[in-house]
Amino acid sequence: QVHLVESGGGVVQPGRSLRLSCAASGFKFRSYGMHWVRQAPGKGLEWVAIIWYDGSKRYYADSVKGRFTISRDNSKNTLYLQMSSLRAEDTAVYYCARDLITGTTDYWGQGTLVTVSS
Amino acid sequence: DVVMTQSPLSLPVTLGQPASISCRSSRSLVYSDGNTHLIWFQQRPGQSPRRLIYRVSNRVSGVPDRFSGSGSGTDFTLKISRVEAEDVGVYYCLQGAHWPYTFGQGTKLEIKR
């Protein structure tokens, strides 16, 4: 069974950094592109970033470009999101996800809450 | 960025009645692989999102056949033929044809009492 479990969320001050992790199991992690999607409290979904199966390509939403870095460790079946220069507007539940665009099934984690506040 | 505009933003529906949600994109969503990558998601209260439809009209396995997607180019529609209580939630369209991917604002479906 496919499982995605995010961790690393918490309360952080503006301008500081935080690293989120997503532990994947139940599928061949090294064969899949992986995404981060976020949802601010009471708001809609915002796609954040994608990384290719082998880590070779990465794309970002304009709102996080230059501040966030998506990465992966295929030997550990883990996806990461390094967030720096955090702003209040980055406050959201962050989800990792697989197969947003194609394939017969998509998979999402339960999300981890990041609160940026002084 | 491609702007995705959903309407209506709120949709009260009577149980058993049909529902229709529109999604318009600011650019064509036909990708270089020849497919149109417009996706619909459902997010029930307190849950993670789940994909209902991919490539405009392909239902994800396990999704009831009362859900259907249609459209082309820049105009797309999600239809629910007979709304059930479990359909309550927010529905989002997503374009996967241009970087960065972008979601619509969401349409909140609720049951009329």
Epitope: F27, S31, Y32, I50, I51, W52, Y53, D54, G55, T102 | -
Partner: antibody, heavy 124, light 111 residues
Framework: DVQLQESGPGLVKPSQSLSLTCSVT?????????WNWIRQFPGNKLEWMGY???????NYNPSLKNRISITRDTSKNQFFLKLNSVTTEDTATYYC?????????????????WGQGTSVTVSS | DILLTQSPGSLAVSLGQRATISCKAS??????????MSWYQQKPGQPPKLLIY???NLESGTPARFSGSGSGTDFTLNIHPVEEEDAATYYC?????????FGGGTKLEIK
């Protein structure tokens, strides 16, 4: 369009090393993908030998692990196969190939672009 | 290693008829609901050509008369209706587990 072309000696003596080159045009081998070597023995049996990734990391068939090395020259957009201590059993047609990936970051561990192959005979 | 056994070793099919090739794996080629099984066509003097990936997905340029099915340990390639240009040897290949392995091939002749 992506093209791969194998080259190397057609005849190698037993116990020596076999060295082959795969020249890639139309795509940078440092951008993405797995760059593979596969061989086909007389009688047509196919064997996956290993690959080098865009970042230089390797994955080899365990049956060849102590004899095989796949390296690259990024400036020439080439990758190489070196097989040590060859025997007549290594006589085969050697292909280089690229794995396939879709537009959305997924791979299916299949091989979509192949070279034409180069025939290697191991004989004294 | 996962051993792939193809059957039949060769078959002769009349033009317009159906050709069915089986590939049986010694262990599952599935992981997390996905089938890492591909099919290739090889003509004399040419490299193998990818036809189908992930058990049933047609590679770009593969004619619709080719179809793949199956999961777990049992996979099938169907060609219908067979055309003259389909005369070739067909191979299955699994990528679920290292090392990637190929079937022994099935030679298709047109009657």
């Amino acid at each position: 369009d992506v093209q791969l072309q194998e080259s190397g000696p057609g005849l190698v003596k037993p116990s020596q090393s076999l060295s082959l080159t795969c020249s890639v045009t139309g795509y940078s081998i440092t951008s993405s993908y797995y760059w593979n070597w596969i061989r086909q023995f007389p009688g047509n049996k196919l064997e996956w030998m290993g690959y080098i990734m865009y970042d230089g990391n390797n994955n080899y068939n365990p049956s060849l692990k102590n004899r095989i090395s796949i390296t690259r020259d990024t400036s020439k957009n080439q990758f190489f196969l070196k097989l040590n201590s060859v025997t007549t059993e290594d006589t085969a047609t050697y292909y280089c190939a690229r794995n396939m990936a879709d537009y959305f970051g997924n791979t299916y561990d299949a091989l979509d672009y192949w070279g034409q192959g180069t025939s290697v005979t191991v004989s004294s | 290693d996962i051993l792939l056994t193809q059957s039949p070793g060769s078959l002769a099919v009349s033009l317009g008829q159906r050709a069915t090739i089986s590939c049986k794996a010694s262990q599952s080629a599935d992981y997390g609901g996905d089938s890492y099984m591909s099919w290739y066509q090889q003509k004399p003097g040419q490299p193998p050509k990818l036809l189908i990936y992930a058990a049933s997905n047609l590679e770009s340029g593969t004619p619709a008369r080719f179809s793949g099915s199956g999961s777990g340990t049992d996979f099938t390639l169907n060609i219908h209706p067979v055309e003259e240009e389909d005369a070739a040897t067909y191979y299955c290949q699994q990528g679920n587990e290292d090392p990637w392995t190929f079937g022994g091939g099935t030679k298709l002749e047109i009657k």
